[in-house]
Amino acid sequence: LKGQEFAPSHQQVYAPLRADGDKPRAHLTVVRQTPTQHFKNQFPALHWEHELGLAFTKNRMNYTNKFLLIPESGDYFIYSQVTFRGMTSECSEIRQAGRPNKPDSITVVITKVTDSYPEPTQLLMGTKSVCEVGSNWFQPIYLGAMFSLQEGDKLMVNVSDISLVDYTKEDKTFFGAFLL
Amino acid sequence: LKGQEFAPSHQQVYAPLRADGDKPRAHLTVVRQTPTQHFKNQFPALHWEHELGLAFTKNRMNYTNKFLLIPESGDYFIYSQVTFRGMTSECSEIRQAGRPNKPDSITVVITKVTDSYPEPTQLLMGTKSVCEVGSNWFQPIYLGAMFSLQEGDKLMVNVSDISLVDYTKEDKTFFGAFLL
Amino acid sequence: LKGQEFAPSHQQVYAPLRADGDKPRAHLTVVRQTPTQHFKNQFPALHWEHELGLAFTKNRMNYTNKFLLIPESGDYFIYSQVTFRGMTSECSEIRQAGRPNKPDSITVVITKVTDSYPEPTQLLMGTKSVCEVGSNWFQPIYLGAMFSLQEGDKLMVNVSDISLVDYTKEDKTFFGAFLL
């Protein structure tokens, strides 16, 4: 059988098999954000629910202090959705005055922090100009991709404006990762 | 080999190994919806193509009556994209009259139904205000995340307005799930 | 153990087990596109970074000439995000003149090419009308789903307008696939 070798005379080295059910996995859901000190020149990080409702962490994937901690090296699929909501951006008012304008924007970044590396690495970014014309607007940004991570890496979700994040429902704003 | 134990003297319990190819999987694609009766106070559910073109179900993952039926407990990645299209929303007319307005919106919800549980559970929601200014608009909402499901759970996709769903192409509107 | 049989008297056929770490996988990231000849009536294909930064290919998944080459038949999860950016579309000018208008649009298609089949197959499409009112706009389109692919199939990402693709950062525009 592929990937298994029982006869000791064979010298091939096979990657170890492992049960799917014991792989590190997490799905975190939104909680209301409390005002905190943000790092200068860095988008603020969201904190998350990790055990109530739909949220869970398992198989040594731990959540602590806004970070998902990667317990084992390998290729992970990482995803997040952030739903933003706000009032009409200034954009429309400026537009009415006939002047060109820099649009407001909303941005989500999934960031990797490696202790041995001085700078965080931006893995995924979703960024969108917001120049809405209704009095209220709301919209999600979804991200997901596969990355090779090392044991001890930490993942977080940063947003451009924490006060625009819709924290009302666990199905609207979430963050997850699983070892492939 | 990790996850396998042949020596009976070892008392450790290992998670069973299983071939990836026999895991429950489905990718469903859009078909045109015909006017039907909807449940009161619930977004209508889409029905799907499950065997023609790109669509398939395999390894006991069955599609029946708008539901994907989960045949085995475990962690599943679930995803859907719904492309909406419509004519200019009322929003712009109201805006021109200078009054604030509640924007029109489009919403997709992936819902889990558990027979032993009275209320459906909303797993994922993508919701977006639509205040478009062109005469026609179109846009997708994409969702995807991992959830722990139980054998017998049923999944469906609900939308805020079934008549705005773009049913023309199987690559624009779809729904899928696979056991990790 | 499920999927394994050591006793020769059993006649059941089991799907082969395989180590997760040796499955074909790729994550490609954006590079600046150079002007090239496009096929008539087909959206231009993006080319990608496959080894620098966050990008990688592994386990016989190869990237060549805008294509990801599928080395082994099976079910793959395929994903891409393309971030577009542009100046105000004509849409708003036409609107101001009070005439109805056909909106500009942005489209991403993940396409499968099978040598034995004359026509490419569109697996996934994300398409969005763009009728922005700010002087600059930017937004991502994300796609991801599972497909049954055959050894030798080739995958590419096509876009409606290559000049609107944001090529500035590897986390904004990317393309990947992995065998489940």
Epitope: - | R32, D166, K169 | -
Partner: antibody, heavy 118, light 107 residues
Framework: EVQLVQSGAEVKKPGASVKVSCKAS????????MHWVRQAPGQGLEWMGW????????NYAQKFQGRVTMTRDTSISTAYMELSRLRSDDTAVYYC???????????WGQGTMVTVSS | DIQMTQSPSSLSASVGDRVTITCRAS??????LNWYQQKPGKAPKFLIY???RLQSGVPSRFSGSGSGTDFTLTISSLQPEDFATYYC?????????FGPGTKVDIK
Amino acid sequence: EVQLVQSGAEVKKPGASVKVSCKASGYTFTGYYMHWVRQAPGQGLEWMGWINPNSGGTNYAQKFQGRVTMTRDTSISTAYMELSRLRSDDTAVYYCAVGGSYDAFDIWGQGTMVTVSS
Amino acid sequence: DIQMTQSPSSLSASVGDRVTITCRASQSISSYLNWYQQKPGKAPKFLIYGASRLQSGVPSRFSGSGSGTDFTLTISSLQPEDFATYYCQQGYSNPFTFGPGTKVDIK
């Protein structure tokens, strides 16, 4: 079974108004757009506009703007189309039609003949 | 407005014939094209949506093809109940418009 039942034939004088009703059954009335399409004798089909029964929002063909009003009464699952300032060339069969998508017409009413004659 | 044209405007055919009707849009309408059948004194009946997809309950002898501006409705083997007028309709943009119709009668 999905059904649309329209009101009976009408004879009107030029300059008058006509209001045609369309009662829906067999589906969720508020879930699908209701369209109105007309057909002059021996002629082709002409789309007049739609109403979203859920919100009451409407979209009229430019040709009928200012003369047509589409309304609905959700309590009785009925849509209405009123055409004012009638002319002789408004003589036609008026159909209501509902679609599973807003851009097509799955089920049609039986039609209401409106004759405009002095 | 998007103009829809059909050809021929009428045709005579026999039972068992293969019949092809074409529809052209004045600008690209992607796949947002529908076909209807209408018999005298009756309301139209929905046949094909999305240019090529058969509405539930419609016989498989009907098929549609095309994308962009040029579309075709084909009846592979004409049956007695197929003698009628056929209309194409674009659902791409406001206002929705119909072709002028193609009348299929008995030769």
